[in-house]
Amino acid sequence: ASGSASGSASTLVHNGTSARATTTPASKSTPFSIPSHHSDTPTTLASHSTKTDASSTHHSSVPPLTSSNHSTSPQLSTGVSFFFLSFHISNLQFNSSLEDPSTDYYQELQRDISEMFLQIYKQGGFLGLSNIKFRPG
Amino acid sequence: SVVVQLTLAFREGTINVHDVETQFNQYKTEAASRYNLTISDVSVSDVPFPFSAQSHHHHHH
């Protein structure tokens, strides 16, 4: 009684570009490719892609990131630090559409959160966010 | 309410866990006014790499 894999990707979203593992469906209302979300596949930072329309995605290789001598969190060989972040949004209500990146509610909330993080960490060093997951509080 | 869980990526050596959390907490008031998001219960931790999408969402259930 097995189902099919969701076919979704974990996407690193930053300023309209994304490092992604597999292609995801075109978003109806977001400026970037469909929002990052958990899937059955591991996260990989494979390539930058810029979504230009519903059917075309342009890829180019990721430039190597500068590695420094001291480490602030577990490292990728490319010199990237990852942090897991969790928080509550108390003035929003969860509903099942927040489990699906093609819904308006998911896309609007993902867009707001992505923009917010770009504001918070606008100093150098911030590469983006990935693996957004919403659940009831 | 909605619990949000995600992974942030930074260039190595530019920030630590404490600073990630501090900067996020400092922005909470602006988040409420600009995005109408009332944020609480912030938690930040390191993510070991290589990691999978499965591995780092077990912090809070």
């Epitope: 097995s2 969701s6 979704s8 059955d40 559409s97 990146p101 | 259930h61």
Partner: antibody
Framework: EVQLVQSGAEVVKPGASVKMSCKTS????????INWVRQRPGQGLEWIGY????????EYNEKFKGRVTLTSDTSASTAYMELSSLRSEDTAVYYC??????????WGQGTLVTVSS | DIQLTQSPSSLSASVGDRVTITCRAS??????LNWLQQKPGKAIKRLIY???SLDSGVPSRFSGSRSGSDYTLTISSLQPEDFATYYC?????????FGGGTKVEIK
């Protein structure tokens, strides 16, 4: 491989209740949503409700409100659906479908419930 | 509730034929539409999610598209294992609803 295994067929009397289970395996997340859907003999599919595993968050189709209770047991990775005040028109195959990055990604094999006196 | 009108309710086709099934939504549902395949005695299988994205392991002969409020599932070259019943499903708003189904039979 994600698997959803549903409990076996049930024969129940009108007015009684039935509780069926949907156990998921092959997936390390302990938090995700389960939708319940039914299919009456020779008919199409009908959405019953949704539960987010490991929480008390539920959504119900108004048509079933008051008769359906969705619950879950995170430690057993199992969702349950109880349907009460059964009538003959509740004879159907009941399916669970869970999320996996998006809604309705994986489906169980179904549980046949026969309501008969 | 959002109604999904699926057509045809049944069709007969031969192996190799191109088959098209349509669902019309009574309200705007964006891209929140899945296509499902049901075979007797087997678990339901999702083929297409978010209108046009192919699920992992689903053959590329299956495709989904949208034109306004019309959503289409196309099987480019019907294979023996494709004889089944197909349903569309909208999850734009609760209660989630299904099309009436299309039974694809051997001619």
């Amino acid at each position: 491989e994600v698997q959803l295994v549903q409990s076996g067929a049930e024969v129940v009397k009108p007015g009684a209740s039935v509780k069926m289970s949907c156990k998921t395996s092959g997936y390390t997340f302990t938090s995700y949503g389960i939708n319940w859907v039914r299919q009456r003999p020779g008919q199409g599919l009908e959405w019953i409700g949704y539960i987010y595993l490991g929480s008390d968050y539920t959504e119900y189709n108004e048509k079933f409100k008051g008769r359906v209770t969705l619950t879950s047991d995170t430690s057993a990775s199992t969702a349950y659906m109880e349907l009460s005040s059964l009538r003959s028109e509740d004879t159907a195959v009941y399916y669970c479908a869970r999320s996996g990055g998006s809604l309705f990604a994986y489906w169980g094999q179904g549980t046949l419930v026969t309501v008969s006196s | 509730d959002i109604q999904l009108t699926q057509s045809p309710s049944s069709l007969s086709a031969s192996v190799g034929d191109r088959v098209t099934i349509t669902c019309r939504a009574s309200q705007d549902i964006g891209i929140t539409l899945n296509w499902l395949q049901q075979k007797p005695g087997k678990a339901i299988k999702r083929l297409i999610y978010a209108t046009s994205s192919l699920d992992s392991g689903v053959p590329s002969r299956f495709s989904g598209s949208r034109s306004g409020s019309d959503y289409t599932l196309t099987i480019s070259s019907l294979q023996p294992e494709d004889f089944a019943t197909y349903y569309c499903l909208q999850y734009a708003s609760s209660p989630y609803t299904f099309g009436g189904g299309t039974k694809v039979e051997i001619k």
